[in-house]
Protein backbone atom coordinates (compact mmCIF):
# COMPACT_ATOMS: atom_id res chain seq x y z
CA UNK A 1 0.00 0.00 0.00
CA UNK A 2 1.38 3.33 -1.04
CA UNK A 3 -1.08 5.52 0.80
CA UNK A 4 -2.86 5.60 4.11
CA UNK A 5 -5.71 7.84 5.27
CA UNK A 6 -6.30 8.73 8.89
CA UNK A 7 -9.28 10.82 10.00
CA UNK A 8 -10.02 12.94 13.07
CA UNK A 9 -13.12 10.77 13.66
CA UNK A 10 -14.79 8.28 11.31
CA UNK A 11 -18.21 9.09 12.82
CA UNK A 12 -19.33 12.63 13.49
CA UNK A 13 -22.44 14.70 14.10
CA UNK A 14 -24.20 15.39 10.83
CA UNK A 15 -22.95 18.77 9.56
CA UNK A 16 -19.79 18.77 11.67
CA UNK A 17 -16.31 19.27 10.15
CA UNK A 18 -13.93 16.40 9.65
CA UNK A 19 -10.16 16.49 9.06
CA UNK A 20 -8.32 13.78 7.16
CA UNK A 21 -4.67 13.16 6.31
CA UNK A 22 -3.29 11.03 3.48
CA UNK A 23 0.35 9.96 3.64
CA UNK A 24 2.25 8.50 0.65
CA UNK A 25 5.30 6.46 1.55
CA UNK A 26 8.66 7.42 0.08
CA UNK A 27 9.36 3.90 -1.18
CA UNK A 28 6.62 4.11 -3.73
CA UNK A 29 9.39 4.76 -6.29
CA UNK A 30 7.22 4.30 -9.34
CA UNK A 31 5.36 7.44 -8.37
CA UNK A 32 6.14 10.96 -9.38
CA UNK A 33 8.70 12.36 -6.89
CA UNK A 34 6.38 15.31 -6.33
CA UNK A 35 2.96 13.69 -6.72
CA UNK A 36 -0.18 15.79 -6.34
CA UNK A 37 -2.55 14.12 -3.90
CA UNK A 38 -6.23 14.50 -4.79
CA UNK A 39 -9.23 14.02 -2.48
CA UNK A 40 -12.59 12.62 -3.39
CA UNK A 41 -15.77 12.36 -1.27
CA UNK A 42 -18.00 9.85 -2.96
CA UNK A 43 -17.75 10.74 -6.63
CA UNK A 44 -16.88 14.41 -6.10
CA UNK A 45 -13.35 15.79 -6.09
CA UNK A 46 -12.70 17.91 -3.01
CA UNK A 47 -10.47 20.95 -3.30
CA UNK A 48 -8.53 22.39 -0.41
CA UNK A 49 -5.98 19.71 0.39
CA UNK A 50 -2.74 21.13 1.86
CA UNK A 51 0.22 19.04 0.78
CA UNK A 52 3.72 18.91 2.24
CA UNK A 53 6.81 16.72 2.17
CA UNK A 54 7.72 15.43 5.59
CA UNK A 55 11.28 15.05 6.89
CA UNK A 56 11.29 11.31 6.23
CA UNK A 57 10.48 11.92 2.58
CA UNK A 58 6.84 10.97 2.73
CA UNK A 59 4.17 13.18 1.20
CA UNK A 60 1.20 14.25 3.31
CA UNK A 61 -2.01 15.95 2.29
CA UNK A 62 -4.41 17.27 4.90
CA UNK A 63 -7.99 18.27 4.12
CA UNK A 64 -10.73 19.68 6.28
CA UNK A 65 -14.29 19.10 5.12
CA UNK A 66 -16.18 21.98 6.78
CA UNK A 67 -19.54 20.17 6.95
CA UNK A 68 -20.12 16.46 6.54
CA UNK A 69 -23.67 16.47 5.24
CA UNK A 70 -23.76 12.88 4.04
CA UNK A 71 -24.91 10.24 6.50
CA UNK A 72 -22.53 7.80 4.83
CA UNK A 73 -19.78 8.39 2.29
CA UNK A 74 -16.35 7.11 1.23
CA UNK A 75 -13.44 9.54 1.43
CA UNK A 76 -10.49 8.58 -0.76
CA UNK A 77 -7.11 10.01 -1.59
CA UNK A 78 -5.73 9.41 -5.07
CA UNK A 79 -3.06 10.31 -7.63
CA UNK A 80 -3.35 11.03 -11.30
CA UNK A 81 -1.84 8.00 -13.03
CA UNK A 82 -1.76 8.49 -16.70
CA UNK A 83 -5.29 9.34 -17.71
CA UNK A 84 -6.90 7.72 -14.73
CA UNK A 85 -7.16 8.33 -11.03
CA UNK A 86 -5.24 5.84 -8.88
CA UNK A 87 -6.95 5.35 -5.51
CA UNK A 88 -4.36 5.07 -2.74
CA UNK A 89 -6.68 4.53 0.24
CA UNK A 90 -10.25 5.14 1.28
CA UNK A 91 -12.19 5.27 4.53
CA UNK A 92 -15.88 5.14 5.26
CA UNK A 93 -17.27 8.22 6.97
CA UNK A 94 -20.55 8.16 8.89
CA UNK A 95 -22.52 11.11 10.19
CA UNK A 96 -25.65 11.21 12.25
CA UNK A 97 -26.99 12.13 15.63
CA UNK A 98 -26.63 10.79 19.16
CA UNK A 99 -29.73 8.88 20.23
CA UNK A 100 -32.63 10.93 21.51
CA UNK A 101 -34.11 9.93 24.85
CA UNK A 102 -36.46 6.98 24.25
CA UNK A 103 -39.96 8.01 25.29
CA UNK A 104 -43.43 6.61 26.00
CA UNK A 105 -42.03 3.50 27.67
CA UNK A 106 -44.90 1.28 28.76
CA UNK A 107 -45.22 -2.34 29.80
CA UNK A 108 -47.90 -4.98 30.11
CA UNK A 109 -47.91 -8.34 31.85
CA UNK A 110 -49.10 -11.20 29.67
CA UNK A 111 -50.24 -14.06 31.88
CA UNK A 112 -50.49 -16.48 28.97
CA UNK A 113 -46.86 -16.10 27.91
CA UNK A 114 -45.80 -15.34 31.51
CA UNK A 115 -43.77 -12.37 30.38
CA UNK A 116 -43.59 -8.62 30.86
CA UNK A 117 -43.66 -6.96 27.44
CA UNK A 118 -42.32 -3.42 27.30
CA UNK A 119 -42.42 -1.07 24.33
CA UNK A 120 -41.13 2.42 23.67
CA UNK A 121 -40.73 5.05 20.96
CA UNK A 122 -37.09 5.33 19.89
CA UNK A 123 -37.21 8.93 18.75
CA UNK A 124 -35.92 10.46 15.50
CA UNK A 125 -33.67 8.60 13.08
CA UNK A 126 -30.02 8.81 14.10
CA UNK A 127 -28.64 7.58 10.72
CA UNK A 128 -26.21 5.44 12.72
CA UNK A 129 -26.35 1.91 14.08
CA UNK A 130 -28.14 2.44 17.40
CA UNK A 131 -28.72 -0.28 19.95
CA UNK A 132 -31.55 -0.31 22.46
CA UNK A 133 -31.42 -2.24 25.73
CA UNK A 134 -34.27 -2.70 28.16
CA UNK A 135 -32.68 -2.57 31.61
CA UNK A 136 -34.36 -3.45 34.88
CA UNK A 137 -33.86 -4.32 38.50
CA UNK A 138 -35.92 -5.70 41.36
CA UNK A 139 -36.76 -3.37 44.20
CA UNK A 140 -38.36 -3.92 47.57
CA UNK A 141 -39.56 -0.33 47.80
CA UNK A 142 -40.49 2.37 45.31
CA UNK A 143 -37.39 1.80 43.13
CA UNK A 144 -35.25 4.32 45.01
CA UNK A 145 -33.15 1.43 46.26
CA UNK A 146 -31.93 -1.02 43.65
CA UNK A 147 -32.14 -4.74 44.34
CA UNK A 148 -30.96 -7.55 42.08
CA UNK A 149 -30.30 -6.54 38.49
CA UNK A 150 -32.24 -8.40 35.87
CA UNK A 151 -30.56 -9.68 32.73
CA UNK A 152 -30.67 -7.03 29.99
CA UNK A 153 -33.35 -7.51 27.38
CA UNK A 154 -32.11 -6.78 23.85
CA UNK A 155 -34.79 -6.45 21.18
CA UNK A 156 -34.41 -7.94 17.74
CA UNK A 157 -33.04 -5.49 15.17
CA UNK A 158 -35.46 -2.73 14.33
CA UNK A 159 -37.93 -3.62 17.09
CA UNK A 160 -38.96 -1.22 19.82
CA UNK A 161 -40.23 -3.80 22.28
CA UNK A 162 -38.77 -6.54 24.42
CA UNK A 163 -40.11 -9.33 26.64
CA UNK A 164 -38.77 -10.08 30.09
CA UNK A 165 -39.49 -13.75 30.82
CA UNK A 166 -41.15 -14.95 34.01
CA UNK A 167 -37.95 -16.32 35.52
CA UNK A 168 -36.65 -12.74 35.79
CA UNK A 169 -39.88 -11.33 37.24
CA UNK A 170 -41.19 -11.08 40.76
CA UNK A 171 -44.91 -10.52 40.90
CA UNK A 172 -46.27 -8.20 43.60
CA UNK A 173 -42.88 -6.55 43.89
CA UNK A 174 -41.74 -3.36 42.18
CA UNK A 175 -39.28 -3.30 39.33
CA UNK A 176 -37.31 -0.37 37.97
CA UNK A 177 -37.37 -0.43 34.16
CA UNK A 178 -35.80 1.89 31.60
CA UNK A 179 -34.48 1.87 28.05
CA UNK A 180 -30.91 2.74 27.17
CA UNK A 181 -30.10 3.83 23.62
CA UNK A 182 -26.50 3.85 22.46
CA UNK A 183 -24.55 4.65 19.32
CA UNK A 184 -21.09 5.90 18.43
CA UNK A 185 -22.05 9.48 19.31
CA UNK A 186 -23.56 8.93 22.73
CA UNK A 187 -25.92 7.23 25.12
CA UNK A 188 -29.34 8.25 26.37
CA UNK A 189 -31.74 6.78 28.88
CA UNK A 190 -35.51 6.96 29.14
CA UNK A 191 -37.17 8.03 32.36
CA UNK A 192 -37.44 5.04 34.70
CA UNK A 193 -40.71 3.23 35.22
CA UNK A 194 -41.38 1.75 38.65
CA UNK A 195 -44.03 -0.94 38.50
CA UNK A 196 -45.33 -4.19 39.90
CA UNK A 197 -45.87 -6.51 36.91
CA UNK A 198 -49.32 -7.41 38.23
CA UNK A 199 -50.34 -3.75 38.07
CA UNK A 200 -49.91 -3.79 34.30
CA UNK A 201 -51.62 -7.14 33.73
CA UNK A 202 -53.57 -7.45 30.51
CA UNK A 203 -56.23 -10.14 30.69
CA UNK A 204 -57.79 -12.09 27.89
CA UNK A 205 -61.41 -11.09 27.22
CA UNK A 206 -64.36 -13.32 28.11
CA UNK A 207 -66.16 -15.21 25.33
CA UNK A 208 -69.61 -13.87 24.56
CA UNK A 209 -72.38 -16.41 24.12
CA UNK A 210 -76.10 -16.43 23.43
CA UNK A 211 -78.01 -17.27 26.57
CA UNK A 212 -79.68 -20.64 26.15
CA UNK A 213 -83.41 -20.06 26.56
CA UNK A 214 -84.71 -22.05 29.51
CA UNK A 215 -88.34 -23.25 29.47
CA UNK A 216 -89.25 -21.33 32.63
CA UNK A 217 -87.55 -18.06 31.63
CA UNK A 218 -89.48 -15.37 29.82
CA UNK A 219 -88.27 -14.67 26.25
CA UNK A 220 -86.49 -11.36 25.75
CA UNK A 221 -88.68 -8.32 25.26
CA UNK A 222 -88.70 -6.50 21.94
CA UNK A 223 -85.55 -4.43 21.58
CA UNK A 224 -83.71 -6.58 24.13
CA UNK A 225 -80.94 -9.15 23.86
CA UNK A 226 -80.03 -11.83 26.39
CA UNK A 227 -76.39 -12.76 26.42
CA UNK A 228 -73.89 -14.43 28.69
CA UNK A 229 -70.14 -14.66 28.82
CA UNK A 230 -67.58 -17.22 29.81
CA UNK A 231 -64.69 -15.59 31.72
CA UNK A 232 -61.13 -16.35 30.73
CA UNK A 233 -60.42 -19.11 33.21
CA UNK A 234 -56.79 -18.29 34.12
CA UNK A 235 -57.89 -14.80 35.13
CA UNK A 236 -60.97 -15.91 37.04
CA UNK A 237 -59.58 -15.09 40.49
CA UNK A 238 -58.65 -11.54 39.49
CA UNK A 239 -61.35 -9.02 40.35
CA UNK A 240 -62.37 -7.28 37.17
CA UNK A 241 -64.87 -4.92 35.69
CA UNK A 242 -66.08 -5.32 32.14
CA UNK A 243 -67.83 -3.31 29.48
CA UNK A 244 -69.92 -4.23 26.46
CA UNK A 245 -70.15 -2.41 23.19
CA UNK A 246 -72.75 -2.91 20.51
CA UNK A 247 -73.84 -1.51 17.17
CA UNK A 248 -76.32 -2.47 14.47
CA UNK A 249 -74.71 -4.63 11.80
CA UNK A 250 -76.15 -2.50 9.00
CA UNK A 251 -75.54 1.19 8.59
CA UNK A 252 -72.83 3.50 9.82
CA UNK A 253 -73.72 3.67 13.51
CA UNK A 254 -70.81 3.96 15.94
CA UNK A 255 -70.31 1.67 18.90
CA UNK A 256 -72.46 2.25 21.99
CA UNK A 257 -70.78 1.44 25.30
CA UNK A 258 -72.51 -0.28 28.23
CA UNK A 259 -70.84 -0.64 31.60
CA UNK A 260 -69.20 -1.10 33.93
CA UNK A 261 -70.39 -4.68 34.36
CA UNK A 262 -68.95 -6.94 37.03
CA UNK A 263 -67.19 -9.96 35.54
CA UNK A 264 -69.33 -12.10 37.82
CA UNK A 265 -72.55 -10.93 36.22
CA UNK A 266 -71.88 -13.66 33.64
CA UNK A 267 -75.20 -12.88 31.98
CA UNK A 268 -76.94 -9.72 30.96
CA UNK A 269 -80.11 -8.43 29.36
CA UNK A 270 -79.37 -5.53 27.07
CA UNK A 271 -82.42 -3.39 26.30
CA UNK A 272 -83.25 -0.15 24.55
CA UNK A 273 -82.22 -1.53 21.17
CA UNK A 274 -84.05 -1.41 17.86
CA UNK A 275 -86.47 -4.32 17.43
CA UNK A 276 -85.88 -6.90 14.68
CA UNK A 277 -82.34 -5.68 14.18
CA UNK A 278 -79.09 -7.62 13.93
CA UNK A 279 -76.43 -6.34 16.37
CA UNK A 280 -72.71 -6.94 16.76
CA UNK A 281 -71.55 -7.16 20.38
CA UNK A 282 -68.14 -7.32 22.05
CA UNK A 283 -66.90 -7.37 25.65
CA UNK A 284 -63.63 -6.46 27.35
CA UNK A 285 -62.43 -6.47 30.96
CA UNK A 286 -59.82 -4.87 33.19
CA UNK A 287 -58.39 -5.78 36.59
CA UNK A 288 -60.29 -3.66 39.09
CA UNK A 289 -60.18 -2.06 41.66
CA UNK A 290 -56.45 -2.83 41.43
CA UNK A 291 -54.54 -1.38 38.46
CA UNK A 292 -54.34 -3.14 35.11
CA UNK A 293 -54.73 -2.77 31.35
CA UNK A 294 -57.94 -3.28 29.40
CA UNK A 295 -58.11 -6.58 27.58
CA UNK A 296 -58.62 -6.55 23.85
CA UNK A 297 -62.22 -6.62 22.73
CA UNK A 298 -63.61 -10.13 22.51
CA UNK A 299 -64.50 -11.78 19.22
CA UNK A 300 -67.84 -10.45 18.04
CA UNK A 301 -71.17 -12.07 18.83
CA UNK A 302 -73.97 -11.41 16.38
CA UNK A 303 -77.53 -11.45 17.73
CA UNK A 304 -80.91 -10.28 16.50
CA UNK A 305 -83.47 -8.52 18.66
CA UNK A 306 -87.02 -9.86 18.61
CA UNK A 307 -89.78 -8.16 16.67
CA UNK A 308 -92.20 -5.88 18.45
CA UNK A 309 -95.46 -7.71 19.00
CA UNK A 310 -98.21 -5.82 17.13
CA UNK A 311 -100.78 -4.19 19.44
CA UNK A 312 -104.40 -3.51 18.54
CA UNK A 313 -103.62 0.21 18.34
CA UNK A 314 -100.62 -0.44 16.15
CA UNK A 315 -102.68 -2.58 13.78
CA UNK A 316 -105.42 0.06 13.60
CA UNK A 317 -102.88 2.73 12.73
CA UNK A 318 -101.97 0.94 9.50
CA UNK A 319 -105.51 1.05 8.12
Amino acid sequence: ECGHISVSAPIVHLGDPITASCIIKQNCSHLDPEPQILWRLGAELQPGGRQQRLSDGTQESIITLPHLNHTQAFLSCALNWGNSLQILDQVELRAGYPPAIPHNLSCLMNLTTSSLICQWEPGPETHLPTSFTLKSFKSRGNCQTQGDSILDCVPKDGQSHCSIPRKHLLLYQNMGIWVQAENALGTSMSPQLCLDPMDVVKLEPPMLRTMDPSPEAAPPQAGCLQLSWEPWQPGLHINQKCELRHKPQRGEASWALVGPLPLEALQYELCGLLPATAYTLQIRCIRWPLPGHWSDWSPSLELRTTERAPTHHHHHHHH
Epitope: L111, T112, T113, S114, R166, K167, L171, M198, P231, Q233, P234, L236, H237, I238, N239, P262, E264, A265, L266, P289
Partner: antibody, heavy 118, light 107 residues
Protein backbone atom coordinates in the same frame (compact mmCIF):
# COMPACT_ATOMS: atom_id res chain seq x y z
CA UNK B 1 -52.17 -10.45 60.18
CA UNK B 2 -54.45 -12.58 57.99
CA UNK B 3 -56.29 -15.22 60.03
CA UNK B 4 -58.79 -17.92 59.10
CA UNK B 5 -60.59 -19.91 61.76
CA UNK B 6 -62.75 -22.91 60.84
CA UNK B 7 -65.49 -24.32 63.03
CA UNK B 8 -68.46 -26.67 62.78
CA UNK B 9 -66.70 -29.98 62.30
CA UNK B 10 -67.63 -33.09 64.23
CA UNK B 11 -69.08 -36.60 64.04
CA UNK B 12 -72.08 -37.12 61.80
CA UNK B 13 -73.90 -40.18 60.49
CA UNK B 14 -73.95 -41.10 56.80
CA UNK B 15 -76.71 -39.17 55.06
CA UNK B 16 -76.52 -36.41 57.66
CA UNK B 17 -75.68 -32.72 57.29
CA UNK B 18 -73.11 -30.33 58.71
CA UNK B 19 -72.33 -26.69 58.20
CA UNK B 20 -68.75 -25.48 58.40
CA UNK B 21 -67.87 -21.85 59.01
CA UNK B 22 -64.66 -19.94 58.45
CA UNK B 23 -64.19 -16.58 60.16
CA UNK B 24 -61.74 -14.32 58.35
CA UNK B 25 -59.81 -11.34 59.65
CA UNK B 26 -56.83 -9.17 58.74
CA UNK B 27 -57.77 -8.50 55.10
CA UNK B 28 -60.60 -7.09 52.99
CA UNK B 29 -62.64 -10.27 52.82
CA UNK B 30 -65.05 -8.99 50.14
CA UNK B 31 -62.24 -8.56 47.58
CA UNK B 32 -61.02 -12.15 47.53
CA UNK B 33 -62.06 -15.53 46.28
CA UNK B 34 -62.17 -18.10 49.06
CA UNK B 35 -62.06 -21.88 48.97
CA UNK B 36 -62.36 -25.16 50.82
CA UNK B 37 -59.77 -27.93 50.55
CA UNK B 38 -59.99 -31.24 52.38
CA UNK B 39 -57.60 -33.98 53.39
CA UNK B 40 -58.74 -37.49 54.23
CA UNK B 41 -56.71 -39.23 56.98
CA UNK B 42 -53.28 -40.21 55.61
CA UNK B 43 -54.16 -38.92 52.13
CA UNK B 44 -53.32 -35.94 49.95
CA UNK B 45 -55.07 -32.62 49.42
CA UNK B 46 -58.34 -32.40 47.50
CA UNK B 47 -59.95 -29.17 46.35
CA UNK B 48 -63.64 -29.07 47.29
CA UNK B 49 -65.07 -25.72 46.20
CA UNK B 50 -64.32 -22.03 45.65
CA UNK B 51 -66.43 -18.90 45.72
CA UNK B 52 -65.87 -15.57 43.98
CA UNK B 53 -65.56 -12.32 45.87
CA UNK B 54 -69.24 -11.44 45.63
CA UNK B 55 -70.47 -15.02 45.63
CA UNK B 56 -71.69 -15.19 42.03
CA UNK B 57 -69.35 -17.95 40.86
CA UNK B 58 -69.16 -21.24 42.79
CA UNK B 59 -67.30 -24.12 41.14
CA UNK B 60 -67.35 -27.54 42.86
CA UNK B 61 -65.36 -30.76 42.67
CA UNK B 62 -67.33 -33.55 40.98
CA UNK B 63 -67.15 -35.59 44.18
CA UNK B 64 -69.30 -33.07 46.10
CA UNK B 65 -71.42 -31.48 43.35
CA UNK B 66 -75.09 -31.42 44.26
CA UNK B 67 -74.42 -32.25 47.90
CA UNK B 68 -72.26 -29.37 49.14
CA UNK B 69 -73.02 -25.65 48.90
CA UNK B 70 -70.43 -22.93 49.39
CA UNK B 71 -71.55 -19.44 50.41
CA UNK B 72 -70.23 -16.32 52.04
CA UNK B 73 -71.45 -13.38 54.09
CA UNK B 74 -69.22 -10.43 53.29
CA UNK B 75 -70.82 -8.33 56.02
CA UNK B 76 -69.72 -10.92 58.58
CA UNK B 77 -66.39 -11.82 56.92
CA UNK B 78 -67.45 -15.44 57.02
CA UNK B 79 -67.23 -18.34 54.57
CA UNK B 80 -69.56 -21.35 54.81
CA UNK B 81 -69.74 -24.90 53.52
CA UNK B 82 -73.12 -26.60 53.84
CA UNK B 83 -72.59 -30.35 53.55
CA UNK B 84 -75.61 -32.59 52.94
CA UNK B 85 -75.97 -36.30 52.19
CA UNK B 86 -72.64 -36.96 53.84
CA UNK B 87 -70.77 -40.17 53.05
CA UNK B 88 -67.97 -42.05 54.77
CA UNK B 89 -65.57 -40.88 52.05
CA UNK B 90 -66.23 -37.25 53.06
CA UNK B 91 -64.35 -37.91 56.31
CA UNK B 92 -61.46 -35.45 56.28
CA UNK B 93 -59.92 -32.37 57.77
CA UNK B 94 -61.54 -29.41 56.00
CA UNK B 95 -59.41 -26.32 55.48
CA UNK B 96 -60.63 -22.94 54.41
CA UNK B 97 -58.18 -20.78 52.47
CA UNK B 98 -57.95 -17.42 50.76
CA UNK B 99 -57.26 -17.56 47.03
CA UNK B 100 -54.60 -15.39 45.42
CA UNK B 101 -55.17 -13.63 42.10
CA UNK B 102 -53.50 -16.43 40.15
CA UNK B 103 -55.29 -19.20 42.00
CA UNK B 104 -52.98 -20.20 44.84
CA UNK B 105 -54.24 -20.90 48.37
CA UNK B 106 -52.71 -18.70 51.06
CA UNK B 107 -53.09 -18.57 53.96
CA UNK B 108 -54.93 -21.64 55.26
CA UNK B 109 -56.98 -22.10 58.38
CA UNK B 110 -55.97 -24.65 60.98
CA UNK B 111 -58.60 -27.10 59.72
CA UNK B 112 -61.68 -28.73 61.22
CA UNK B 113 -62.22 -32.50 61.31
CA UNK B 114 -65.41 -33.96 59.86
CA UNK B 115 -66.02 -37.62 60.64
CA UNK B 116 -68.84 -39.43 58.85
CA UNK B 117 -69.52 -42.73 60.58
CA UNK B 118 -72.37 -44.74 61.92
CA UNK C 1 -59.89 -31.84 33.64
CA UNK C 2 -56.20 -31.13 34.19
CA UNK C 3 -54.65 -33.86 36.34
CA UNK C 4 -51.37 -33.41 38.19
CA UNK C 5 -48.79 -36.18 38.55
CA UNK C 6 -46.06 -35.68 41.14
CA UNK C 7 -42.86 -37.69 41.43
CA UNK C 8 -41.36 -39.25 43.36
CA UNK C 9 -44.08 -40.08 45.89
CA UNK C 10 -41.38 -40.23 48.56
CA UNK C 11 -37.64 -39.75 48.87
CA UNK C 12 -34.97 -40.06 51.51
CA UNK C 13 -32.30 -37.39 51.76
CA UNK C 14 -29.73 -35.99 54.15
CA UNK C 15 -29.29 -32.49 55.50
CA UNK C 16 -27.37 -30.44 52.92
CA UNK C 17 -28.59 -32.49 49.96
CA UNK C 18 -30.05 -30.92 46.86
CA UNK C 19 -33.58 -32.20 46.40
CA UNK C 20 -35.71 -32.02 43.24
CA UNK C 21 -39.42 -32.80 43.02
CA UNK C 22 -41.25 -32.81 39.70
CA UNK C 23 -44.84 -32.19 38.79
CA UNK C 24 -46.43 -32.89 35.41
CA UNK C 25 -49.74 -31.52 34.17
CA UNK C 26 -51.90 -33.59 31.80
CA UNK C 27 -52.14 -30.52 29.52
CA UNK C 28 -50.45 -27.14 29.28
CA UNK C 29 -51.07 -24.79 32.20
CA UNK C 30 -48.72 -21.92 31.26
CA UNK C 31 -47.18 -20.89 34.62
CA UNK C 32 -50.23 -21.57 36.79
CA UNK C 33 -48.49 -23.96 39.15
CA UNK C 34 -48.14 -23.54 42.93
CA UNK C 35 -46.14 -25.49 45.51
CA UNK C 36 -47.02 -26.16 49.17
CA UNK C 37 -45.26 -27.66 52.16
CA UNK C 38 -47.18 -29.58 54.83
CA UNK C 39 -45.91 -30.92 58.12
CA UNK C 40 -47.79 -33.59 60.10
CA UNK C 41 -50.85 -32.22 61.91
CA UNK C 42 -50.44 -28.77 60.34
CA UNK C 43 -52.12 -26.87 57.55
CA UNK C 44 -50.30 -26.60 54.22
CA UNK C 45 -48.11 -23.56 53.65
CA UNK C 46 -47.60 -21.83 50.29
CA UNK C 47 -43.97 -21.91 49.11
CA UNK C 48 -44.08 -20.86 45.46
CA UNK C 49 -46.81 -19.41 43.25
CA UNK C 50 -47.04 -18.95 39.50
CA UNK C 51 -44.29 -21.52 38.96
CA UNK C 52 -41.31 -19.52 40.21
CA UNK C 53 -42.37 -16.72 42.59
CA UNK C 54 -41.15 -17.27 46.12
CA UNK C 55 -43.81 -16.45 48.70
CA UNK C 56 -42.80 -13.85 51.30
CA UNK C 57 -40.94 -15.36 54.24
CA UNK C 58 -39.98 -18.55 52.41
CA UNK C 59 -36.20 -19.25 52.48
CA UNK C 60 -34.36 -18.69 49.19
CA UNK C 61 -33.14 -22.30 49.15
CA UNK C 62 -36.58 -23.11 47.69
CA UNK C 63 -37.01 -22.41 44.00
CA UNK C 64 -39.48 -23.33 41.30
CA UNK C 65 -39.10 -23.61 37.55
CA UNK C 66 -40.88 -24.88 34.47
CA UNK C 67 -43.83 -23.93 32.31
CA UNK C 68 -46.41 -25.65 30.15
CA UNK C 69 -46.62 -29.19 31.48
CA UNK C 70 -43.38 -29.85 33.38
CA UNK C 71 -42.46 -28.16 36.64
CA UNK C 72 -39.79 -28.58 39.29
CA UNK C 73 -39.44 -27.65 42.95
CA UNK C 74 -35.81 -27.55 44.08
CA UNK C 75 -34.44 -27.33 47.62
CA UNK C 76 -30.81 -26.34 47.11
CA UNK C 77 -29.56 -27.46 50.52
CA UNK C 78 -31.97 -29.48 52.62
CA UNK C 79 -32.39 -28.27 56.22
CA UNK C 80 -33.80 -30.25 59.18
CA UNK C 81 -37.04 -28.20 59.09
CA UNK C 82 -37.61 -29.12 55.42
CA UNK C 83 -38.57 -32.72 56.13
CA UNK C 84 -42.26 -32.61 55.18
CA UNK C 85 -44.70 -33.47 52.40
CA UNK C 86 -44.78 -31.25 49.31
CA UNK C 87 -47.73 -30.73 46.97
CA UNK C 88 -48.11 -29.04 43.61
CA UNK C 89 -51.42 -27.50 42.46
CA UNK C 90 -52.61 -26.24 39.10
CA UNK C 91 -54.67 -23.05 39.03
CA UNK C 92 -55.05 -22.66 35.28
CA UNK C 93 -58.67 -23.75 35.21
CA UNK C 94 -61.39 -25.43 37.25
CA UNK C 95 -61.59 -28.01 38.64
CA UNK C 96 -58.42 -27.27 40.61
CA UNK C 97 -56.19 -30.27 41.26
CA UNK C 98 -53.31 -31.03 43.61
CA UNK C 99 -50.55 -33.51 42.90
CA UNK C 100 -50.44 -36.67 45.01
CA UNK C 101 -47.66 -35.33 47.22
CA UNK C 102 -43.96 -36.07 47.80
CA UNK C 103 -42.85 -37.07 51.28
CA UNK C 104 -39.28 -35.99 52.02
CA UNK C 105 -37.84 -38.19 54.78
CA UNK C 106 -34.54 -38.28 56.64
CA UNK C 107 -32.09 -40.83 55.25
Amino acid sequence: EVQLLESGGGLVQPGGSLRLSCAASGFTFSLYWMGWVRQAPGKGLEWVSSISSSGGVTPYADSVKGRFTISRDNSKNTLYLQMNSLRAEDTAVYYCAKLGELGWFDPWGQGTLVTVSS
Amino acid sequence: DIQMTQSPSSLSASVGDRVTITCRASQGISSYLNWYQQKPGKAPKLLIYYASNLQNGVPSRFSGSGSGTDFTLTISSLQPEDFATYYCQQSFMYPLYFGGGTKVEIK
